[in-house]
């Protein structure tokens, strides 16, 4: 009989469920923007805004100094009066809408959606290795902001992104607003604009450069501005908005927007539409072509990328990969698919298309009908000409316009659908060691940290737990200060280390071992930790070979029995080649000799189930007492594998040594040409894993085995005879005399 | 490239007024502030005032009150500064430069002589 | 108004030699300083700014530290173009004011 163990599935080695308690901030209301600093002296500060405040954090998430930003017009408001004499603009609630560093002074920006969406400068005083926010400075000029001009009118209370970048001896403000008919016309913020806050920081400089929705396209046309970041030589802006102006304004698609840094200009504004796609690898009847299509953009990050990952996107370790957690609409309701997708855009890759698509409007011969795009910003134009122009003229040029690139960047889910049911609404990545981990905030409060790879059909998680009992959503966007990154979900503020909270959720030494090294886990006899959580028998080099079952569970005291062993760390091998004297197992007293690996019954065992067999055959010693006993594998002196060796013991209960015993045997007579079915009674008659009834030292074949009734039929006789029968159980006679007659057909 | 330039020497009267104008280039004239410097023979440097381009405010070094006045053209990206009612201890070298933190951008320096 | 106290009022030191030139402030200023060089008959020449970020294509043996009230402008291994006169300036509010100054000599 061929008995073979139960899978265990990959997911029994790890418990999800494990409560973790990481630091946090009790903010006192909803978290509305978040920002951390870390200055040169190891003086570092976290700043955590809500309604009407703004609060300073130390490292160690407690609270240094408070800030009131709001209400608008309320004597108490400790920002407003910054700007002198009221009244400055209607009374209101502040709600943050910009919280960013200017890293060259250094310095905290924060901008709010009252007092026409204006901001205030809050110098930084490192005291020890907290910081504290000097008085604040409005930057606000009165006399110089008008509802049709206002350069000190930043933020919009639809939503405004913003870059801070130095050029030169300036700190440049690259601002992204989202707009509508109201909004536009209350102190014309602009779509998206470049704004040089002035050196005595009484506000921005005018006459600076912008692009705005175009007046008759504000009511339909809504542009929401999802992330921003400067690397290299640009600033680039992500949107999600309508993927025409002529059509369904709820047909929506997500674009990148790119910026020079390095020059204060808007000529060479460029957007390219990023295509990211959930394509399983067995295609549905009906499903689309190239895959289902995730065009919404939730939340992203760019980072640079560990050596794996970059080998799998054909690019260079290091490099800065935009990475996006798309869905299928505005609600991320549920689809065919899965409920989020991440892909993957590689910064550079990003560049040369966009580059390209310059090319192709500007350098002839330009294909007939190649339109410039962006017609909710600008005159419609045909390539090469400059928007609502109906040719270049000899002083223009056709690099100097914003241009909406002609081809789209086409990626697929890099986790291949895995994420299934899980609303993703937070992501930072960083690299450890040569590993490229995502952090993501989930709708349910969770934090999942998972290997960013492509080529695996499971997920490697270095953790996944709650926050904390709210199970509010986690918010967009995260911070990174030293080693930790900081969540928001509600009123809190967490702090969760880049390397996983811990590494209890791991419950087997063998996937402790396997853990990531930048995780610290080590086992402690009977759980994974860190070090410091249990410091006296905390390790990372062996682990012990773990039994969790075996086959058959009773044997004959005499005779022997192939016992099979389950479990896991066996081997550490694939092969599952044993180097000779390692491996001792013993039943009681008896030894177990291991036998060789029959090649014929390996078979390959996917990655999200696992389990180890070791057989060995049992030989009871002649002192060995029926009765029940342990089975013991001891494993010693193996070779190391890739993460540990395996060294120790393991020991299951629940073997029985038994002696089988014939009762009778009925009828005890037959026909010569054979084929009578013969019923042996007794007891323990199935002990071990072989026995065979022999008439007259012929096999008579088994049709039936239980504890206490074997079934055969008897083979033909040879002539008319009385012939012994005899039973063995495990190659060994069990005691008794008996015959059969064969007897004329 | 931004390049400021200034007018040349002057040789004035006690008593008399003198302008000086700096003119901009490379880069864009209303965006920044334009910012006058004395400096007199073996001293250090004196912040008189500056001027926003755009909007042409102005703001003073409370001993400059009275004696200089700052104007700027936008049509030709020109700042110009007058001194009134010269003496001696006007005499020194008066610089443009252009807002920043910390001026990157200075101009030749024009040179004002008050003699009788 | 702001004070600017620059000291030493003169140095002298060889090519080669490091030099530390120190500014204060009579109020804190964080880190709106800036460090020029003046050359004799030219125009100031910006160095630092932001009390530490060297202005572009000054040489790295220049260095800017400080915050709030005390500043300094350090020189590395000084070379013969190095000697001239330096000053420190705040920009943190108005009127925006100069040290006095500090002449560095060959000596």
């Known amino acids: 009989e061929d008995w073979q163990c139960p899978r265990t599935p990959y997911a029994a080695s790890r418990d999800f469920d494990v409560k973790y308690v990481v630091p946090s901030f009790s903010a006192g209301g909803l978290v509305q923007a978040m920002v951390t600093y870390e200055g040169d002296r190891n003086e570092s500060a976290v700043f955590v805004a809500i309604r009407n405040r703004l609060h300073v954090l130390g490292p160690d998430l407690k609270s240094v100094q408070s800030l009131a930003t709001g209400p608008a017009g309320d004597p108490g408001c400790q920002t407003c009066a910054a700007c002198g004499p009221g009244p400055h603009g209607p009374p209101g609630d502040t709600d943050t809408k910009v919280l960013v560093l200017d890293p060259a002074l250094p310095a905290l920006v924060s901008c709010g959606s009252s007092l026409q969406g204006r901001c205030f400068l809050h110098d930084l005083e490192p005291q020890g290795t907290a910081v504290h926010l000097a008085a604040p400075a409005c930057l606000f000029s009165a006399h110089h902001n008008r509802p049709d001009d206002c350069p000190d009118c930043v933020a919009s209370p639809l939503g405004t992104r913003v870059t801070v970048v130095e050029q030169g001896q300036a700190s440049y403000f690259y601002v992204a607003s989202s707009l509508d008919a109201a909004v536009a016309a209350s102190f014309s913020p602009r779509s998206v604009s470049i704004r040089r806050l002035k050196a005595d920081a009484s506000g921005f400089a005018p006459g600076f450069v912008a692009l705005s929705v175009l007046p008759k396209h504000l009511v339909s046309y809504s542009i929401e501005y999802v992330h921003s970041f400067h690397t290299g030589a640009f600033v680039y802006f992500l949107t999600v908005q309508p993927a025409s102006v002529t059509d369904d304004p709820s047909a929506l698609h997500t674009r990148l927007a790119r910026l020079s840094a390095t020059e204060p200009e808007l000529g060479d504004y460029r957007e390219l539409v990023l295509d990211c796609r959930f394509a399983p690898k067995r295609r549905r009847r009906g499903a689309p072509e190239g895959g289902q299509p995730y065009p919404v953009l939730r939340v992203a990050h760019s980072a640079p990328v560990g050596a794996q990952l970059a080998t799998e996107l054909s690019i260079a370790e290091g490099q800065e990969v935009l990475f996006g957690v798309f869905v299928t609409g505005k609600d991320g309701g549920p689809g065919v698919g899965p409920n989020s997708v991440v892909c993957a855009f590689p910064i550079d890759l990003l560049d040369t298309l966009i580059d390209e698509g310059v090319e192709r409007c500007c350098e002839s011969p330009v294909h007939p009908g190649l339109r410039r795009g962006l017609d909710f910003f600008q005159s419609p134009s045909f390539c090469p000409n400059p928007p609502g122009l109906e040719a270049l003229s000899p002083n223009t040029s056709c690099r100097h316009f914003p241009l909406l690139v002609s081809s789209s960047f086409s990626r697929v889910d890099l986790f291949n659908g895995l994420l299934g049911p899980v609303q993703v609404t937070a992501l930072y990545v960083t690299r450890l060691d040569n590993v490229t981990v995502a952090h993501m905030g989930t709708m349910d409060g969770r934090i999942l940290q998972v290997e960013l790879v492509r080529s695996l059909n499971y997920l490697l998680y270095v953790s996944n737990f709650s926050l904390g009992d709210s199970g509010q959503p986690v918010q967009r966007d995260v911070s990174r200060l030293g080693d930790h990154l900081l969540f928001a979900s509600g009123d809190q503020v967490f702090q969760v280390p880049i390397q996983g909270p811990g590494c209890r959720h791991f419950l087997t030494c063998g996937r402790c071992l396997r853990a990531w090294h930048f995780m610290g886990c080590g086992w402690c006899g009977n759980m994974c930790g860190q070090q410091k959580e249990c410091p006296g028998s905390w390790q990372q080099d062996h682990c012990p070979p773990k039994l969790t079952e075996f086959h058959p569970h009773s044997g004959p005291l005499r005779g022997s029995t192939r016992l099979t062993l389950c479990g896991s760390n066996f081997y550490l091998h694939p092969s599952g080649l044993v180097p000779e004297g390692t491996h001792q197992v013993t039943v009681g007293q008896s030894p177990c000799r291991p036998l060789p690996k029959d090649s014929s019954k390996l078979r390959p065992v996917p990655r999200k189930d696992f389990v180890e067999e070791f057989e060995c055959e049992l030989e009871p010693l002649g002192t060995q007492a029926v009765g029940p006993t342990n089975v013991s594998l001891t494993v010693t002196n193996m070779p190391p594998g890739k993460h540990f060796r395996v060294d120790g013991t393991s020991v299951l209960r629940g073997f029985s040594f038994m002696e089988p015993v014939l009762i009778a045997v009925q009828p005890l007579f037959g026909p010569r040409a054979g084929g009578t079915c013969l019923t042996l009674e007794g007891q323990s008659l199935s002990v071990g894993t072989s026995r065979a009834v022999l008439v007259n030292g012929t096999e008579c074949l088994l049709a039936r085995v239980s504890e206490g009734q074997l079934l055969c039929a008897t083979p033909p006789g040879a002539t008319v005879a009385s012939v012994p029968l005899s039973l063995q159980v495990g190659g060994a006679q069990v005691p008794g005399s008996w015959t059969f007659q064969y007897r004329e057909d | 490239e931004v390049q400021l330039q200034q007018s040349g020497p002057e040789l004035e009267k006690p008593g008399a007024s003198v302008m000086i104008s700096c003119k901009a280039s490379?880069?864009?004239?209303?965006?920044?502030?334009m910012n006058w410097v004395k400096q007199s023979t073996g001293k250090s440097l004196e912040w008189i005032g500056d001027?926003?381009?755009?909007?042409?405010?102005?703001r003073y070094n409370q001993k400059f009150k009275g004696k200089a006045t700052l104007t700027a053209d936008k049509s030709s990206s020109t700042a110009y500064m007058q001194l009134k009612s010269l003496t001696s201890e006007d005499s020194a070298v008066y610089y443009c430069t252009r807002e920043g933190r910390g001026f990157a951008y200075w101009g030749q320096g024009t040179l004002v002589t008050v003699s009788a | 108004d702001i004070q600017m106290t620059q000291s030493p009022a003169s140095l002298s030191a060889s090519v080669g030699e490091t030099v530390t030139i120190t500014c204060r402030a009579s109020e804190n200023i964080y880190s709106y300083l800036a460090w020029y060089q003046q050359k004799q008959g030219k125009s100031p020449q910006l160095l630092v700014y932001n009390a530490k970020t060297l202005a572009g294509g000054v040489p790295s043996r220049f260095s800017g530290s400080g915050s709030g009230t005390q500043f300094s402008l350090k020189i590395n291994s000084l070379q013969p173009e190095d000697f001239g006169s330096y000053y420190c300036?705040?920009?943190?509010?108005?009127?925006?004011?100069f040290g006095a100054g500090t002449k560095l000599e060959l000596k």
């Open positions: 490379g880069y864009s004239f209303t965006g920044y502030n």
């Open positions: 001027i926003d381009p755009y909007y042409d405010g102005t």
């Open positions: 300036q705040h920009y943190y509010g108005t009127p925006l004011t």
